[in-house]
Interface confidence: medium
């Protein structure tokens, strides 16, 4: 079927990096400069993505595959083949429509990406707070109150209505 | 691939609990959060709580608290989630789905295929 | 506690174009993702942050906002995209829940 479809199909016999050229009777001709082809018998070669702005290259354009790029410094990937770069925020915050927004109450993020978490609820385990949370900290939860000993101390959480948890996650 | 393979359909009466088992396979179990999720017949869908599977913290919607509880079992790669003193208004499907947040964007991107719990006398 | 609102039912044309549109405080701060089902099976995302299509989800499905609500767009609706469709975001309300989902839109393709 190969040798038929070939025989009928001159392009099909054009590697990758090359394209089925019809100004030239159907020769495989090299993809020009700044392109490429990633398959056989391709009659045109695909135009390289150019990494520019808060793009950078990852991987260079060549003949048989295209370049690949992520984010300059500051900036992090979004979607399919890093379509789009999006800031940093900082520990801390999120980003949101607006940019960059400090965790609400309630909430943390301990990284530079990623959205604000809801603080750990201790009593949900039976146990107290011996750390309270920050925007960038989990609370750090200790032994149940029943197990602490006499004039041991613990954090008091916080009041009900802005128990951990209870905020945006 | 990624896959969250929930338990059977159960059929509970008023007053008892269920307990539904959620299996995940195809990624590293303890980096996303796993949120449950129902729907009575008809409705949309209703957000119930989220488990840490690392750490095994949980958060859930005030009108659940009291009345549900999700663990997990990381040597199983499963989260559980159960809800005691069923009402018929309980009935729904329910389904876990994975929290992938794509660095800063919220999103279930992977849910179970669903669990019927009809809760009738 | 905050909600997101969506008209129940959307029609439209085979081949045309239409919006989905979702409504809520939280949408101001977050966006919104969204979802289809089709009978008897699970909610499947289609878009998510500032117009970002899972793989798999074809370019006819696209997300944009305004002010305090974000927009699905089919554009060159299929019969197949018959469903019903619900956005999502997190909540900004200091109390329960977390996570909030709209009523759902069921759309029709003439």
């Known amino acids: 079927f190969e040798r038929t479809r070939s025989l009928q199909d001159p392009c099909s016999n054009c590697p990758a990096g090359t394209f089925c050229d019809n100004n030239r009777n159907q020769i495989c001709s090299p993809c020009p400069p700044n392109s490429f082809s990633s398959a056989g018998g391709q009659r045109t070669c695909d135009i390289c993505r150019q990494c520019k702005g808060v793009f950078r290259t990852r991987k260079e354009c060549s003949s048989t595959s295209n370049a690949e790029c992520d984010c300059t410094p500051g900036f992090h990937c979004l979607g399919a083949g890093c379509s789009m770069c999006e800031q940093d925020c900082k520990q801390g915050q999120e980003l949101t429509k607006k940019g960059c927004k400090d965790c609400c109450f309630g909430t943390f993020n301990d990284q530079k990406r990623g959205i604000c978490r809801p603080w750990t609820n201790c009593s949900l385990d039976g146990k107290s707070v011996l750390v309270n949370g920050t925007k960038e900290r989990d609370v750090v939860c200790g032994p149940s109150p029943a197990d602490l000993s006499p004039g041991a101390s613990s954090v008091t959480p916080p009041a009900p209505a802005r128990e951990p948890g209870h905020s945006p996650q | 691939q990624v896959q969250l393979v929930q338990s059977g359909a159960e059929v509970k009466k008023p007053g008892a609990s269920v307990k539904v088992s959620c299996k995940a396979s195809?990624?590293?179990?303890?980096?996303?959060?796993m949120h449950w999720v129902r729907q009575a017949p008809g409705q949309g869908p209703e957000w119930m709580g989220v488990i840490n599977p690392s750490s095994g913290g949980t958060t859930y919607a005030q009108k659940f608290q009291g009345r549900l509880t999700v663990t997990r079992d990381t040597s199983s790669s499963t989260v559980y989630m159960e809800l005691s003193s069923l009402r018929s208004e309980d009935t729904a499907v329910y389904y876990c789905?994975?929290?992938?947040?794509?660095?800063?964007?919220?999103?279930?991107?992977?849910w179970g295929q669903g669990t019927t719990v009809t809760v009738s006398s | 506690s905050s909600e997101l609102t969506q008209d129940p039912a959307v029609s439209v044309a085979l081949g045309q174009t239409v919006r989905i549109t979702c409504q809520g405080d939280?949408?101001?701060?977050?966006?919104a993702s969204w979802y289809q089902q089709k009978p008897g099976q699970a909610p499947r995302l289609l878009i998510y942050g500032k117009n970002i299509r899972p793989s798999g989800i074809p370019d006819r499905f696209s997300g944009t906002d305004s002010g305090n609500t974000d927009f699905l767009t089919i554009t060159g609706a299929q019969a197949e995209d018959e469903a019903d469709y619900y956005c999502?975001?997190?909540?900004?309300?200091?109390?329960?829940?977390?996570?909030?989902f709209g009523g759902g839109t069921k759309l029709t393709v003439l």
């Open positions: 789905a994975r929290d992938d947040v794509f660095d800063y964007y919220f999103g279930l991107d992977v």
């Open positions: 195809g990624y590293t179990f303890t980096s996303k959060w």
């Open positions: 939280s949408l101001r701060r977050y966006y």
């Open positions: 999502n975001s997190r909540d900004t309300d200091a109390n329960q829940p977390l996570v909030l």
